[in-house]
Interface confidence: medium
């Protein structure tokens, strides 16, 4: 059994680990979300640049210092291009998010073009359609009852959008969506202990060919991809969506991770690899945005002054554009964008950020040398709630994102999408679909707390991502009734 003196021997301060669990007992037992545990660890040693912790029995370094973070995420990126999540490449394992550095380079080169401004503009009408359907649904429900659980409600919108934009699928009825959502929810919420196993015995999942994803999920994505490939006769359809790109790759047969195309770094595009990308786009496209929007709506319900300012901005911009929401008007709404950024400061969804050292590495500004294969962790939540960087951090305040304020802060003090080359490939897509929907909501409804709104909202411990425990309950009041 590995002993817990690894960091002591190296003179790195850190919290006392407990047998078997290291410093992750609460998250391993699903009492607290991993992101919350990391935030607590971050807060324990306010004067340290780095903290030595144990994920189960594996020593890892939690980095607090923003300059060090800049080195890891940007300046010395080639040392940290791996996320360090090792499990079977089968069963959805070779997806863009979890892939090792080489696989990621090969895939990333290909998928980045999906999210250019031009492509996003093309997708906008699909998002728009989804948002209109969503508002119609909310309006109809509102006639019966004004209270909503907005987290799961918004999942029906983001599920439609990602299905339409990435896969060309139309979920006509809420029922179809719910069925797909129930399956996809299982990945995010069913407690799988494979991650903990990987922390204790890095590489074991890969050696045993184990996946962290339930079979039902794998089968869902396999049949999804098979159906679309069949519909398009295995060839790109001209829609220029995510699936077309995948079909192009399928025709190529392999992608290379460097411009010289050395076979050592090429990745064969099998149906397994295609399924893995479909899976990660689905998850990344629907859950993160739905959760962010739900939290934003929650904060607007609790902060009516901010909501009033947003409604005024939305009304003004819509009035100037004949009531139409366009790709450009969404970008134009300065206060809306700031409120979105502030939501992500308070509720960064992917926690913690993780990288693996591909060689021994001296941590800048310290005497600490980490060994090859050491996992390095960053807690966006810890940083985002650190009063050193954000005054009164528990207060929702979009003005923190005035250009002037942002300019005063360290560039690594805000990390909702990660940083550097391996940041979130879909962040512009996520922002666009979220802000479009919020704009539509605020143009039609005022959000108020309901009698069941939890004013002390906790983070769901069972989900891999940050999310609201018990959902978010608010009232949506049609504005024609309150104006």
């Amino acid at each position: 059994m590995r002993t817990f003196n690894y960091w002591k021997k190296r003179n790195v301060r850190g919290p006392e680990p407990v047998v078997f669990f290291g410093n992750l007992k609460d998250s391993a037992l699903r009492k607290k979300n991993m992101g919350v545990v990391m935030e607590e660890l971050y807060n324990m040693f306010p004067e340290e640049k780095v903290i030595g912790i144990y994920r189960m029995t594996s020593p890892c370094l939690l980095v607090r210092d923003l300059d060090v973070i800049k080195h890891i995420m940007i300046k010395d990126f080639e040392v940290f291009s791996d996320r360090g999540v090792e499990f079977s490449k089968e069963g959805l394992g070779s997806n863009l998010f979890h892939a090792d550095g080489e696989t990621w380079r090969a895939l990333g080169n290909r998928f980045t073009p999906i999210f250019t401004s031009g492509k996003l503009k093309n997708m906008f009408y699909l998002m728009h359609e989804g948002a209109d359907n969503f508002i119609d649904h909310v309006s109809a429900e509102c006639e019966k009852n004004q209270e909503f659980e907005v987290h799961s409600l918004l999942q029906t919108y983001t599920m439609s959008t990602i299905a339409a934009c990435a896969f060309g699928i139309s979920y006509d009825s809420i029922g179809d969506k719910v069925k797909a959502l129930d399956i996809v929810d299982k990945i995010i919420s069913e407690p799988s202990y494979a991650i903990e196993l990987d922390m204790m015995y890095p590489g074991l999942l890969s050696k045993l060919n184990l996946s962290i994803f339930p079979t039902v999920v794998k089968n869902f994505f396999k049949s999804l991809v098979d159906n679309i490939v069949a519909q398009r006769n295995g060839k790109p359809s001209g829609r220029n969506d995510f699936m077309d790109l995948i079909l192009e790759l399928r025709q190529l047969g392999e992608v290379t991770s460097n411009k010289y195309g050395s076979s050592a770094s090429s990745l064969e595009i099998t149906d397994e690899v295609i399924c893995a990308q479909a899976f990660v786009f689905y998850i990344a496209g629907y859950e993160t945005s739905a959760t962010t929007m739900a939290y934003m709506i929650y904060q607007l319900a609790l902060n009516p002054d901010i909501q009033n300012k947003l409604i005024a901005e939305v009304d003004e911009v819509l009035k100037a554009n004949d009531g139409k929401v366009t790709y450009d008007t969404v970008k134009e709404m300065k206060y809306l964008n700031k409120a979105f950024d502030e939501t992500l400061r308070m509720y960064s969804i992917v926690e913690p950020l993780q990288r693996k050292a591909t060689r021994d590495y001296k941590i800048p500004g310290t005497d600490v040398v980490i060994e090859k294969d050491t996992i390095v962790l960053i807690s966006p939540r810890g940083i985002h709630y650190d009063p050193k960087y954000y005054d009164n951090p528990k207060q929702f305040n979009p003005d923190r994102f005035d250009a002037e304020e942002v300019g005063k802060r360290h560039p690594c003090a805000y990390l909702p999408f990660g940083l550097g080359q391996r940041n979130c490939i879909g962040m512009r897509f996520g922002r666009l679909q979220s802000l479009l929907c919020i704009t539509k909501i605020l143009s039609k409804f005022r959000i108020e707390p309901s009698k069941n709104t939890d004013r002390n909202l906790q983070v769901e411990p069972h989900r891999g991502l940050i999310g609201p425990k018990g959902g978010i309950r608010v009232n949506a009041i049609p504005r024609k009734l309150v104006s």
Partner: nanobody, 119 residues
Framework: QVQLQESGGGLVQTGGSLRLSCAAS????????MGWFRQAPGKERELVAD????????YYSDSVKGRFTISRDNAKNTVYLEIDSLKPGDTAVYYC????????????WGQGTQVTVSS
């Protein structure tokens, strides 16, 4: 249609505990989540807890946090409500209800089961 049948109510002493069950049948795929409500004499019906079938997302009202535990058995299409440290104020008819995703409009209801806490 979704049919709901509660059971497990009865007369209990203060400080005792109780486990209510709600069995769902019919088109249960229409149901995203199940809620337990209670209605005390002369008071309006209040939601006490809610659980989603698919992801197990749980909600408790502030008045019952810590004493009430909601759980589900998907294989049996059954939702449970465990009540500890019962107080006379918990005396009510307890109803289970089903709702769709996103809305908290519960569209299918059981008949209710009486819980009486004696001091």
């Amino acid at each position: 249609q979704v049919q709901l049948q509660e059971s497990g109510g009865g007369l209990v002493q203060t400080g005792g505990s109780l486990r209510l069950s709600c069995a769902a049948s019919g088109r249960t795929s229409r149901s995203y989540a199940m809620g337990w409500f209670r209605q005390a004499p002369g008071k309006e019906r209040e939601l006490v807890a809610d659980i989603a079938w698919s992801d197990g997302r749980i909600y408790y009202s502030d008045s019952v946090k810590g004493r009430f535990t909601i759980s589900r058995d998907n294989a049996k299409n059954t939702v449970y409500l465990e009540i500890d440290s019962l107080k006379p104020g918990d005396t009510a008819v307890y109803y289970c209800a089903s709702r769709a995703r996103g809305t908290v409009l519960y569209n299918y209801w059981g008949q209710g089961t009486q819980v009486t806490v004696s001091s």
